[in-house]
């Protein structure tokens, strides 16, 4: 998982920011994303197809910031000041896993390896940018 580093010049190879078009990821506190995302999807359409697999968890309401957390991986925030996508910080991931993994386990499905919290920054700092839980998401 490649975490964005502060880059005032913006890396020459970085794709431009694009408007968030995935319905689940609208109105969560940011409006721009960048592809490919942190899971390797090359378009928002691809990301949306996989993200929809989590709709049952979102509907269960097992974690208040689950939608924001998932979107931070599938449609990560983009800013022109940073050359790579900015994911959620590890504590948000760990809270989501703690509260939502038991729901998946009821159906004999484990927490996905792709959402491994250990790969996320522990906290937001200039060398490993990540997003804290939003106030009103």
């Amino acid at each position: 998982l490649e975490i964005g580093r502060f880059d005032p010049e913006r890396g020459r190879g970085a794709a431009p920011c694009q408007a968030v078009e995935i319905p689940m990821c609208r109105g969560i506190g940011y409006n721009l994303t960048r592809m490919p995302n942190l899971l390797g999807h090359t378009s928002q359409g691809e990301a949306a197809a996989e993200l929809a697999e989590f709709a049952p968890l979102v509907q269960y309401g097992c974690h208040s910031h689950l939608r924001f957390f998932l979107c931070s991986l599938y449609a990560p925030m983009c800013t022109d000041q940073v050359s790579t996508p900015i994911p959620a910080c590890r504590p948000m991931c760990e809270q989501a896993r703690l509260r939502c993994a038991p729901i998946m386990e009821q159906f004999n499905f484990g927490w996905p390896d792709s959402l491994d919290c250990a790969r996320l920054p522990t906290r937001n700092d200039p060398h490993a940018l990540c997003m804290e839980a939003p106030e009103n998401a």
């Epitope: 899971l39 090359t42 378009s43 359409g45 691809e46 197809a49 929809a52 697999e53 049952p56």
Partner: antibody, heavy 124, light 107 residues
Framework: EVQLVQSGGGLVQPGGSLRLSCAAS????????MNWVRQAPGKGLEWVSR????????YYADSVKGRFTISRDNSKNTLYLQMNSLRAEDTAVYYC?????????????????WGQGTMVTVSS | EIVLTQSPATLSVSPGERATLSCRAS??????LAWYQQKPGQAPRLLIY???NRATGIPARFSGSGSGTEFTLTISSLQSEDFAVYYC?????????FGQGTKVEIK
């Protein structure tokens, strides 16, 4: 033409293994979540397994969990089902099936393109 | 696991007549229900998704309705090519289930 072409079925003894393949043509497989569905002779349809478009999310019916493994190679536009520890009750026609293309960001829980099916017979 | 029960098991209808097939879910599936047609020796074909939306290329004589636990597939005027087995299917959480099927045969 948009289609799924299957291969790999056949006769296998109980406890044996078999790998089914499903090659996509006319569309880019990496855009779609994919499924395997089976149909025992003279019976109805049974969902078997599902894999997300990147391959990072996989799901199985309880009847095959721990024995079957779904995978995909998007660079080859191909879906696979590895079947181990096969039992007589696994005898069926196996179909690969694509998630419905909603032409947008809303997904519908239906399968719009199906392979032609491949027969798997488990017998001694 | 949500169970889908289709009725009747067999429906005998004359060409040109109306056919009404029922699918009942053991608990609510909202509108997340699809209908398929299957002919002998062939793969299933998607007819209806999201309870009432016709799939691409499906004739207007096929229509779906219902929500929650009660769903209906209606074929307004049966053609010879419509005699087949029809399945309903739903997805709940991460599990898919199909109904046992309704065979529509020539009367």
């Amino acid at each position: 033409e948009v289609q799924l072409v299957q291969s790999g079925g056949g006769l296998v003894q109980p406890g044996g293994s078999l790998r089914l393949s499903c090659a996509a043509s006319g569309f880019n497989l990496r855009r779609y979540n994919m499924n395997w569905v089976r149909q025992a002779p003279g019976k109805g349809l049974e969902w078997v397994s599902r894999i997300s478009n990147s391959g990072s999310l996989v799901y199985y019916a309880d009847s095959v969990k721990g024995r079957f493994t779904i995978s995909r190679d998007n660079s080859k536009n191909t879906l696979y089902l590895q079947m181990n520890s096969l039992r007589a009750e696994d005898t069926a026609v196996y179909y690969c099936a694509r998630d419905a293309d909603s032409s947008g960001y809303y997904r519908y829980d239906a399968f719009d393109i199906w392979g032609q099916g491949t027969m798997v017979t488990v017998s001694s | 696991e949500i169970v889908l029960t289709q009725s009747p098991a067999t429906l005998s209808v004359s060409p040109g007549e109306r056919a009404t097939l029922s699918c009942r879910a053991s608990q609510s599936v909202s509108s997340n229900l699809a209908w398929y047609q299957q002919k002998p020796g062939q793969a299933p074909r998607l007819l209806i998704y999201d309870a009432s939306n016709r799939a691409t290329g499906i004739p207007a004589r096929f229509s779906g309705s219902g929500s929650g636990t009660e769903f209906t597939l209606t074929i307004s005027s049966l053609q010879s090519e419509d005699f087949a087995v029809y399945y309903c299917q739903q997805r709940n959480n991460w599990l898919y289930t199909f109904g046992q099927g309704t065979k529509v045969e020539i009367k």
